[in-house]
Interface confidence: medium
């Protein structure tokens, strides 16, 4: 809290300019009118105010707007945004994407702070859904943003927004998140032709069910091993050796290097050794010839 002291003669600020960097904190408090600051916020970012001086400027705005800043001020906060607490931000009503971009720009190159997380949350809730332009903006600043959302939050993403998602945006998503995103992606890309469709859907396939993988195996897609290794184990297990061979195409040889890792390991255990041998890769661990395979899940369903 800065003491209330009279402004020294001749020091009253008539505009927000570089001369203010030479003011001590108490002088800023006494000599800068809050209403003037609010109307000239766009200038603050161009002036090298220190961290400490920004505290004073924030204090002045807090006094002027105890119920929360108007968007006209928020949009021009610049570095002053760094001084805001999540509690401050919860009082705001941010509706403009330009405002969001301006504030994310201030934090660019830094990890997502609690302030930024609160800002995004307020913005998205205000819009009612994560539309394409918002998602585009957020993933541009924070490629991991999508994967930071819960499956429940992801359910509000409209399929049309999926076009804004890049493969790297999904790098840290877990299977539960991909389970939600995959059907949206399937819907978004449904009118594309085979090869183009596969390029777009590839990064979402960690949420694909068995029947979709079987369908893809009929389309000469040549899935790479990195994508295959991210597939749901329960979706891969029912695939036949022939289907996996078609799905991977020339990449099938990579199975040997991954035979001890999921889902390849578990898939091998479910295949007849005879069938695995047809690949000529030396994969071991399949069901020996002459053994009867009982599908227990089917048995349970019938009983």
């Amino acid at each position: 809290e800065v003491e209330k002291t009279a402004c020294p003669s001749g020091k009253k600020a008539r505009e927000i300019d570089e001369s203010l960097i030479f003011y001590k904190k108490w002088e800023l408090e006494a000599c800068v009118d809050a209403a003037l600051l609010a109307t000239q916020m766009d200038r603050v970012n161009a002036i090298p105010f220190t961290y400490e001086q920004l505290d004073v400027l924030k204090h002045k705005l807090d006094e002027l707007y105890p119920q929360g800043y108007p968007e006209s001020v928020i949009q021009h906060l610049g570095y002053l945004f760094l001084k805001m607490s999540p509690e401050d931000i919860r009082k705001w009503n941010v509706t403009s994407l330009e405002t969001l971009k301006a504030l994310l720009e201030v934090n660019k190159g830094h990890e997502m702070s609690p302030q930024v997380a609160t800002l995004i949350d307020r913005f998205v809730k205000g819009r009612g859904q994560l539309d394409k332009d918002t998602l585009d903006t957020l993933t541009a600043f924070y490629p991991g943003y999508l994967c930071s959302l819960s499956p429940e939050e992801l359910s509000s993403v409209p399929p049309s927004s999926i076009w804004a998602v890049r493969p790297q945006d999904l790098d840290t998503c877990d299977p539960r998140q991909l389970d939600v995103l995959y059907p949206k992606a399937r819907l978004a890309f449904q009118n594309m032709n085979g090869s183009e469709y596969f390029v777009k859907i590839q990064s979402f396939l960690g949420g694909a069910p068995t029947e979709d993988l079987k369908a893809l195996s009929q389309q000469n897609v040549s899935m790479d091993l990195a994508t295959f290794m991210k597939l749901r184990t329960d979706a891969v297990l029912p695939l036949t050796v022939a289907e996996v061979q078609k799905l991977l195409g020339p990449h099938v040889e990579g199975l040997k290097a991954e035979e001890r890792h999921r889902p390849v390991r578990d898939w091998i255990l479910r295949q007849r050794q005879d069938d695995l041998d047809t690949l000529g890769l030396g994969l071991q661990g399949g069901i020996p010839n002459g053994y009867l395979v009982l599908d227990l899940s089917m048995q349970e369903a019938l009983s």
Epitope: P48, T50, Y51, E52, L82
Partner: nanobody, 117 residues
Framework: EVQLVESGGGLVQAGGSLRLSCAAS????????MGWYRQAPGKQRELVAA???????NYADSVKGRFTISRDNAKNTVYLQMNSLKPEDTAVYYC???????????WGQGTQVTVSS
């Protein structure tokens, strides 16, 4: 975190000159605005000159026309050329970042400038 070491101070006659240097460690130095500050005995520390990352400068009225701030980003160094020194310039001089991102509460030792009449 940027570490700052000031040097170049000394005893000088009124009207004389000194050149202060501030060596900074830290890869982000070139992106920070920097400032030279001074603190005379019994007085508050005050900013005397500032320089942006791009090199634009600003001076307190009391030193305008006499002091020049400059920077060499390749050497991670900020300078303060002080000409026509006056006894009232006597103080400990410090440099520090003026980045809005960095709380500038970690000050170096400073360098003493004494101007005798």
């Amino acid at each position: 975190e940027v570490q700052l070491v000031e040097s170049g101070g000394g005893l000088v006659q009124a009207g004389g000159s000194l050149r202060l240097s501030c060596a900074a460690s830290g890869s982000t130095f070139s992106s920070y605005p920097m400032g030279w500050y001074r603190q005379a005995p019994g007085k508050q520390r005050e900013l005397v000159a500032a320089i942006s990352s791009g090199g634009s400068t600003n001076y307190a009225d009391s030193v305008k026309g006499r002091f020049t701030i400059s920077r060499d980003n390749a050497k991670n160094t900020v300078y303060l050329q002080m000409n026509s020194l006056k006894p009232e310039d006597t103080a400990v001089y410090y440099c520090n970042t003026r980045s809005p991102r960095v709380p500038n509460d970690s000050w170096g030792q400073g360098t003493q400038v004494t101007v005798s009449s």
